[in-house]
Amino acid sequence: DSSKWVFEHPETLYAWEGACVWIPCTYRALDGDLESFILFHNPEYNKNTSKFDGTRLYESTKDGKVPSEQKRVQFLGDKNKNCTLSIHPVHLNDSGQLGLRMESKTEKWMERIHLNVSERPFPPHIQLPPEIQESQEVTLTCLLNFSCYGYPIQLQWLLEGVPMRQAAVTSTSLTIKSVFTRSELKFSPQWSHHGKIVTCQLQDADGKFLSNDTVQLNVKHTPKLEIKVTPSDAIVREGDSVTMTCEVSSSNPEYTTVSWLKDGTSLKKQNTFTLNLREVTKDQSGKYCCQVSNDVGPGRSEEVFLQVQYAPEPSTVQILHSPAVEGSQVEFLCMSLANPLPTNYTWYHNGKEMQGRTEEKVHIPKILPWHAGTYSCVAENILGTGQRGPGAELDVQYPPKKVTTV
């Protein structure tokens, strides 16, 4: 009853000319030990002789005779469990069907294994995850359906020719279930890797190139933007016009929406790649950026700081401290909103210009009663002179003077 024979081995094994093939194999013959083993190449059953015809690569009988010309073929098995085989070197014409003709005392069995030998080393295969997103670690897998103890190989990863060797882990399998060499590369792709070529290179033990596989990376990423402004220094005067342009240098997938932000807040009805600001006012000064979104998320440009320059506004005066006691010190501060900052100040006491006082602050180290009154100022920058504000009142407190009796 031939159903007693149970075999386990890979269905097909792959190799190339000059390499080797290692065939992991187990079997079970319940009626006793193996007495004869013949390894055929492309066996065919001859009905006339009731035997198999074909090239005998290896023969092992009770007498232990082995064809001397087939030293490259080794049966590494035993009489009851192991049927592992090795062919080293393996040749192109070894391709086809290997037939393991097994005979025990009472039973016979022909087990077939497919052998595929190519002329040149075949390429590995790169497997990518279904989606790759920027800055998210992924594992790229390079798989080669080959492994053989007598022919060490290595798989190397390259990004546009630049080695990425340290993050790769190579493993091999030589089991009855599968024969392969696999390299797994842990990789955190950046948006700049999108569209670039990754290579898995098969090399022999001496680092000689054998074959490779290449893939083009499809890295999903938010839109990458550049903002341009006219004028380029983003410094304008009130009433001037400003144009900001948003350019998408990369987006995967395609962008869907565009918006503009000022100081982090979205500008209404500004949904094109150009932002035109006509006759700007000073309250339009601030940090501008464009935001473009795709299915991955929003991308933001760098911020442009728009400075709208204007002449000083009407000034106010702050007094430290009023009322002031005679003999104490007092400081006056002229405050005026302006861009650029005022460079010159004119001070007034009771409407009369104070000579030699051109700074933002006026310091009087020793207050006298006649210092009391209204202080005002005018600020000036390159765009013009501001208006004099209402001023501030200095009250000077002092003890009685020239007391007369009435």
Epitope: P152, E160, V162, P163, R165, Q166, Q203
Partner: antibody, heavy 116, light 116 residues
Amino acid sequence: EVQLVESGGDLVKPGESLKLSCEASGFTFSNYAMSWVRQTPDRRLEWVATISSIGSFTYYSDSVKGRFTISRDNVKSTLHLQMNNLKSGDTAIYFCARLGVYFDSWGQGTTLTVSS
Amino acid sequence: QLVLTQSSSASFSLGASAKLTCTLSSQHSTYTIEWYQQQPHKPPKFVMEIKKDGSHYTGDGIPDRFSGSSSGADRYLSISNIQPEDETIYICGVSDMIKDQFVYVFGGGTKVTVLG
């Protein structure tokens, strides 16, 4: 046979600029990443810069970032290194090297001296 | 930071066995490294690659007397039956790709002297 021939080394003053070139032959230039490696007067080797096979990526050591620019012309099989704002510490023999998995081929080198 | 440490010099008797050490920074102890040799006034030449498990392969024209091994963060270059022509500088090197930044680091080199 792989051949790499560097040129352009010279004696220059600090702050000046210079461009080195490397002519490659005997292999498919556009298939390989290329690098510049220098050897300082104390005989230490220092990696300077690398450019990927078709030039999309450039990488620099911290000591030259912002001052040096590596570029390539795959039609002419030539590698370049533009060096600006040179310092005395840039004095070295500059080697052009092919980067396979490691530096598998080197030129003979060209000498740069930066001195006032 | 990726660092390779080598002793600056080592002396061996003619015909003896030599073992040179290159030590990786502890957080990079699993990295694959390369050994290069450099004769005076010549470019470096690839000698060998050594992986963390000690597996290695040698470059073209490197005699069988050269072998490699590994232990922890140490990568060893061994020379059996050392010969006068082995007297030169041996430099180890290592590459890394962090995010989108490639770097290559060399050790300081070990000057090997063959006595007798």
